[in-house]
Interface confidence: medium
């Protein structure tokens, strides 16, 4: 309506004796600025005077003078918008209606505001959510319809009279819409908070109590349970009885069902608050709890660990690791179900007690072949001694041991024989799968671990074998000791160092490179004739007749070997010279006569010299002297001399007779 002044402010304000009131207020006058303002207490309109009667709490005039008693009330507004008021302190009798009489140049208005002042501070109001569940965060709100700048207050939360640790957030509102102080507390209630009293306490600035509001918490929660067990330590022996009782310490709402669980699994047909276990077995060991449900959900008790004690069960042995390699380390673990755990162990190796080993584990730092075998153990606890289980087998693997190469042949072995060797060993794990031989040869292996050497060579000295599984072990080499006839027999001239001259002392040696056996005999032969049985053949003074083809033989018990024929050459000066005449020693003049100087020489004659009956050398140097035509005066005695590198030789005289021809005789 355009004929009204427009005001905005809280409809009612609340306070208490001695506090203050702050009245937020805005207005809009119909025209012009505010010229006069009067604050009435419970104003009443007097129709006679056309004015309002009532207690004037505040009055502002054109000259701006305010009576001294009006200092309690302050107009904090202005001439056109703000009409905020403050009353400090406020009294009980201020309750009622406040009238704001506003006048402008041409218009007047009375605006009414309710003021409710109580004798004592009124309580705040706690607001709760419709339902509270355990562990779910909720916000508790404490609201007080009061706020005043001149009168500070605080709101504190208490749980069962004890300040709550959670931080609350306090907010105030002093607006034309609302005036309040509010505290909000975020809080995660537990089941134990159910039924507890929460208080919101109003305090002044010094923490002095002014008023409070309380509520009882209704915290919905699953049933809270306590489990009791007889015996109390839940440790029993097989055959004993056990009783477990489930007690509900709290449930909101009321519980509906009961059940029992073992190791998380529900036990059938157990729906009462008591669980009776009669003549328990070790299988009944485990974690027990009871479960009770209500509309919120199931609640579980703490677990009771029922230990049914029993003597150790038959033990088993675990080996880390089998098979084991000789020299490695191995650990044995004795495993036996028992309650309480075994305190003592007895270990057995191949049925024999291993003294001094009483622990759950046995450690062998360096495994040897004799550690192989069956390991078993017995566990012992306070209730008794278990039985020895089947045990575990330790397999210790190692290279073949004590490998030897064995000659199968009767001894001695002769060159050309067929030799059979075998490779033997003492023990091996795993089994031997192959064999190796040194040196390598094109030899036959007729069966595993056997070597056949056909036509064995004289120089086959040693053979070694290896027996192999995952590893190879070599035997020491074995000497074949092959026997053979002497080898590389040859004739060697010992002296003289240079060529042999007739008359020299000569020694020939019969050499051979090797013989097995070493005991030998020698034989010298020339042209099939035995000359001697020593290793040397000696000539004190060699003659040309000794020249020729020589052989030596060396024999041992295996056989004999001949050298190649060796030619003995004797060097000598020309000898046995003679002059032969052709066609004869009587030749007719005019014919041809040939004289030949025949000789025996080594090396052959290299130079001939011819002499006549006067020992005159003739100018001819070849072996043959040719006279053609021959003359009677050629008749006479001739001799020749032969020369080689060794020396000279001369022939005896040979007479040539030249006779006259018939013609010559005829002419005479």
């Amino acid at each position: 309506d355009s004929s009204k002044w427009v005001f905005e402010h809280p409809e009612t304000l609340y306070a208490w004796e001695g506090a203050c009131v702050w009245i937020p207020c805005t207005y809009r006058a119909l025209d012009g600025d505010l010229e006069s303002f009067i604050l009435f207490h419970n104003p009443e309109y007097n129709k006679n005077t056309s004015k309002f009667d009532g207690t004037r709490l505040y009055e502002s005039t054109k000259d701006g003078k305010v009576p001294s008693e009006q200092k309690r009330v302050q107009f904090l507004g202005d001439k056109n918008k703000n009409c905020t008021l403050s009353i400090h302190p406020v009294h009980l009798n201020d309750s009622g209606q406040l009238g704001l009489r506003m006048e402008s140049k041409t218009e007047k208005w009375m605006e009414r505001i309710h003021l409710n002042v109580s004798e004592r501070p009124f309580p705040p109001h706690i607001q709760l959510p419709p339902e509270i569940q355990e562990s779910q965060e909720v916000t508790l709100t404490c609201l007080l319809n009061f706020s005043c700048y001149g009168y500070p207050i605080q709101l504190q939360w208490l749980l069962e009279g004890v300040p709550m640790r959670q931080a609350a957030v306090t907010s105030t509102s002093l607006t034309i819409k609302s005036v309040f102080t509010r505290s909000e507390l975020k809080f995660s209630p537990q089941w134990s908070h159910h039924g507890k009293i929460v208080t919101c306490q109003l305090q002044d600035a010094d923490g002095k109590f002014l008023s409070n509001d309380t509520v009882q918490l209704n915290v919905k929660h699953t049933p809270k349970l306590e489990i009791k067990v007889t015996p109390s330590d839940a440790i029993v022996r097989e055959g004993d009885s056990v009783t477990m009782t489930c007690e509900v310490s709290s449930s909101n709402p009321e519980y509906t069902t009961v059940s029992w669980l073992k190791d998380g699994t529900s036990l059938k047909k157990q729906n009462t608050f008591t669980l009776n276990l009669r003549e328990v077995t070790k299988d009944q060991s485990g974690k027990y709890c009871c479960q009770v449900s209500n509309d919120v959900g199931p609640g579980r008790s703490e677990e009771v660990f029922l230990q049914v004690q029993y003597a150790p069960e038959p033990s088993t042995v675990q080996i880390l690791h089998s098979p084991a390699v000789e020299g490695s380390q191995v650990e044995f673990l004795c495993m036996s179900l028992a309650n309480p755990l075994p305190t003592n162990y007895t270990w057995y190796h191949n049925g024999k007690e291993m003294q001094g080993r009483t622990e759950e584990k046995v450690h062998i730092p360096k495994i040897l072949p004799w550690h192989a075998g069956t390991y078993s153990c017995v566990a012992e606890n306070i209730l008794g001694t278990g039985q020895r289980g089947p045990g575990a087998e330790l397999d210790v693997q190692y290279p073949p041991k004590k490998v030897t190469t064995v000659i199968q042949n009767p001894m001695p072995i002769r060159e050309g024989d067929t030799v059979t060797l075998s490779c033997n060993y003492n023990s091996s794990n795993p089994s031997v799968t192959r064999y190796e031989w040194k040196p390598h040869g094109a030899w036959e292996e007729p069966s595993l671990g056997v070597l056949k050497i056909q036509n064995v060579g004289w120089d086959n000295t040693t053979i070694a074998c290896a027996a192999c599984n995952s590893w190879c072990s070599w035997a020491s080499p074995v000497a074949l000791n092959v026997q053979y006839a002497p080898r590389d027999v040859r004739v060697r001239k010992i002296k003289p160092l240079s060529e042999i001259h007739s008359g020299n002392s000569v020694s020939l040696q019969c050499d051979f490179s090797s013989s097995h056996p070493k005991e030998v005999q020698f034989f010298w032969e020339k042209n099939g004739r035995l000359l001697g049985k020593e290793s040397q053949l000696n000539f004190d003074s060699i003659s040309p007749e000794d020249a020729g083809s020589y052989s030596c033989w060396v024999n041992n018990s295996i056989g004999q070997t001949a050298s190649k024929a060796w030619t003995l050459e004797v060097l000598y000066a020309p000898r046995r010279l003679r002059v032969s005449m052709s066609p004869g020693d009587q030749v007719m003049e005019g014919k041809s006569a040939t004289l030949t100087c025949e000789s025996d020489a080594n090396p052959p004659v290299s130079h001939y010299t011819w002499f006549d009956w006067n020992n005159q050398s003739l100018p001819y140097h070849s072996q043959k002297l040719r006279l053609e035509p021959v003359k009677v005066q050629h008749s006479g005695a001739y001799w020749c001399q032969g020369t080689n590198s060794v020396g000279k030789g001369r022939s005896p005289l040979s007479t040539l007779t030249v006779y006259y021809s018939p013609e010559t005789i005829g002419r005479r």
Epitope: W347, H349, K352, E353, M354, Q355, G356, R357, V362, H363, I364, P365, K366, L368, W370
Partner: antibody
Framework: QVQLVESGGGVVQPGRSLRLSCAAS????????MHWVRQAPGKCLEWVAV????????YYADSVKGRFTISRDNSKNTLYLQMNSLRAEDTAVYYC???????????????WGQGTLVTVSS | QSALTQPPSVSGSPGQSITISCTGT?????????VSWYQQHPGKAPKLMIY???NRPSGVSNRFSGSKSGNTASLTISGLQAEDEADYYC??????????FGCGTKLTVL
């Protein structure tokens, strides 16, 4: 209680032989590895040899290998050490000691005899 | 097999703690947890004090303790007493299936 008593010590010329004995009582002799340990006058302890509980395996220090032989007679509860080709450096107090048990190797000696003195001198 | 290395002597006052070291190689001390310690009073047989690095036989005072790091084992005696004065030997199993001793440490209680 466990007792180990050595005997057989004395003075011997280099190159000659001597046999030590160790009589055991107070425990199951056949279940334990047995050792010989020696100590030259004023010198260190030196491990000599070990024999397994059943006599199946024997191990020797390098210094005595090939000259000394360890043996046992479980029926007589007695341990022996046959010492051949004795040298001056073999002069020592010889102790017999009980091994910790079956393991033999990685052993420790929980009981010792009082020792017997062997003097090798010409 | 070389002897294990021990200091020739150590000393301490009553109530103090001392440590004796024993150094070997990876083939003995470092390779196995089979180190033992022996106490020997003059003219007496040795007595086992620690076995398998750190275990105490029954009857041996808990003032004696053993440990090992790498190739070195140690014997510690706390709250030293006059009767602890003796020679102390360490011993170890070796990779060649033999045993080896140290050359001993003379402990003097001042």
């Amino acid at each position: 209680q466990v007792q180990l008593v050595e005997s057989g010590g004395g003075v011997v010329q280099p190159g000659r032989s001597l046999r030590l004995s160790c009589a055991a009582s107070g425990f199951t002799f056949s279940a334990y590895g047995m050792h010989w340990v020696r100590q030259a006058p004023g010198k260190c302890l030196e491990w000599v040899a070990v024999i397994l509980y059943d006599g199946s395996n024997k191990y020797y220090a390098d210094s005595v290998k090939g000259r000394f032989t360890i043996s046992r007679d479980n029926s007589k509860n007695t341990l022996y050490l046959q010492m051949n080709s004795l040298r001056a450096e073999d002069t020592a107090v010889y102790y017999c000691a009980r091994g910790s048990g079956w393991l033999q190797l990685g052993d420790y000696f929980d009981y010792w005899g009082q020792g017997t003195l062997v003097t090798v001198s010409s | 097999q070389s002897a294990l290395t021990q200091p020739p002597s150590v000393s301490g006052s009553p109530g103090q703690s001392i440590t004796i070291s024993c150094t070997g190689t990876s083939s003995d001390v470092g390779g196995y947890n089979y180190v033992s310690w022996y106490q020997q009073h003059p003219g007496k047989a040795p007595k086992l004090m620690i076995y398998e690095v750190s275990n105490r036989p029954s009857g041996v005072s808990n003032r004696f303790s053993g440990s090992k790091s790498g190739n070195t084992a140690s014997l510690t005696i706390s709250g030293l007493q006059a009767e602890d004065e003796a020679d102390y030997y360490c011993s170890s199993y070796t990779s060649s299936s033999t045993l080896v001793f140290g050359c001993g440490t003379k402990l003097t209680v001042l």
